[in-house]
């Protein structure tokens, strides 16, 4: 959807920084649009030698990087902070790094929660 | 259509406190944090925080901390910014500001600015 | 804090120019920045979120690019209006932050 009419979507929430930046910590984040943008669930992430960080999920807002993507995967090849972007409800469940300039991908799998829904 | 209007010019001796409201229209008034920054004469933008209007939660900049008291009232949209102990150097324009609902949090909606001059 | 660092910090340009302003963040800031639009007596107006997308009615001559620590705002041909500063501004961890602006002017 996204064309024409308000589109909602489901992502899964979390904020690392949940305590200074005044918000929940994890949860369920549901998306409602405008008319004519289109929402993503997104992702984002730190390796530290192996060891991951998760740092923010949730919403994302209209962004054509994140078009037409059916999974959150990350293809900067390096960076401080990996970053993806999807469409789908709860996409950004799992997460992964796979490079454009090619190298081994890495697939993020979550703990198993109970997530609950942020209002 | 969306819209933040904010309170008149304020002269303020120093030592004193202001305090500037924004008014929201054309939208949810709850469903978006508001954002306040300033700028001085000739100078950048400056964040100072936000509050969510649905919680009531806030987030100063430590810069502003014990000086900064933002609140506001649900039931007629409007959003607050206290400032106390005013110093010559707090002269500045006062913007409210909207965030977007989801990340990135983008500052969508602008307030036209307050000027508060602090003179003696 | 991370710190937001623009350059020029003034550029002078014609009508039809193409401008180029970059931003660099003290660490990664992923997506997470975004560039206003300021001209004289006036409030802050959104040009670009998430570092490359288009705020709605803002014209598609400019653009905005980059991720991590460095990023571009490009005005593709100048026009009158455009005459204005500019900020970049990250939202990825508090404080915000801003950049200390571009003043673009005519030449």
């Known amino acids: 959807s996204g064309r024409g009419e308000a589109e909602t979507r489901e992502c899964i929430y979390y904020n690392a920084n949940w305590e200074l930046e005044r918000t929940n910590q994890s949860g369920l984040e549901r998306c409602e649009g405008e008319q004519d943008k289109r929402l993503h669930c997104y992702a984002s992430w730190r390796n530290s030698s192996g060891t991951i960080e998760l740092v923010k999920k949730g919403c994302w807002l209209d962004d054509f990087n994140c078009y037409d993507r059916q999974e959150c995967v990350a293809t900067e090849e390096n960076p401080q902070v990996y970053f993806c972007c999807c469409e789908g409800n709860f996409c950004n469940e799992r997460f992964t790094h796979l490079p454009e300039a090619g190298g081994p991908e890495v697939t993020y799998e979550p703990p198993p929660t109970a997530p609950t829904l942020l209002t | 259509q969306v819209q933040l209007v904010q309170s008149g010019a304020e002269v303020k001796k120093p030592g004193a406190s202001v305090k500037v409201s924004c008014k929201a229209s054309?939208?949810?008034?709850?469903?978006?944090?508001m954002h306040w920054v300033r700028q001085a004469p000739g100078q950048g933008l400056e964040w100072m925080g936000w509050i969510n209007p649905a919680s009531g939660w806030t987030n100063y900049a430590q810069k502003f901390q014990g000086r900064v008291t933002m609140t506001r009232d649900t039931s007629i949209s409007t959003a607050y910014m206290e400032l106390s102990r005013l110093r010559s150097d707090d002269t500045a324009v006062y913007y409210c500001a909207r965030v977007s609902m989801y990340a990135p949090e983008p500052m969508d909606v602008w307030g036209q600015g307050t000027t508060v001059t602090v003179s003696s | 804090d991370i710190q937001m660092t623009q350059s020029p910090s003034s550029v002078s340009a014609s009508v039809g120019d193409r401008v180029t302003i970059t931003c660099r963040a003290s660490?990664?800031?992923?997506?997470?920045l975004a560039w206003y639009q300021q001209k004289p007596g006036k409030a802050p107006k959104l040009l670009i979120y998430?570092?490359?997308s288009l705020q709605s009615g803002v014209p598609s001559r400019f653009s905005g690019s980059g991720s991590g620590t460095d990023f571009t705002l490009t005005i593709s041909s100048l026009q009158p209006e455009d005459f204005a500063t500019y900020y970049c501004q990250q939202a990825f961890s508090h404080p915000w932050t801003f950049g200390g602006g571009t003043k673009v002017e005519i030449k």
């Open positions: 998430a570092a490359s």
């Open positions: 054309g939208y949810t008034f709850t469903g978006h944090k």
């Open positions: 660490q990664g800031i992923s997506r997470w």
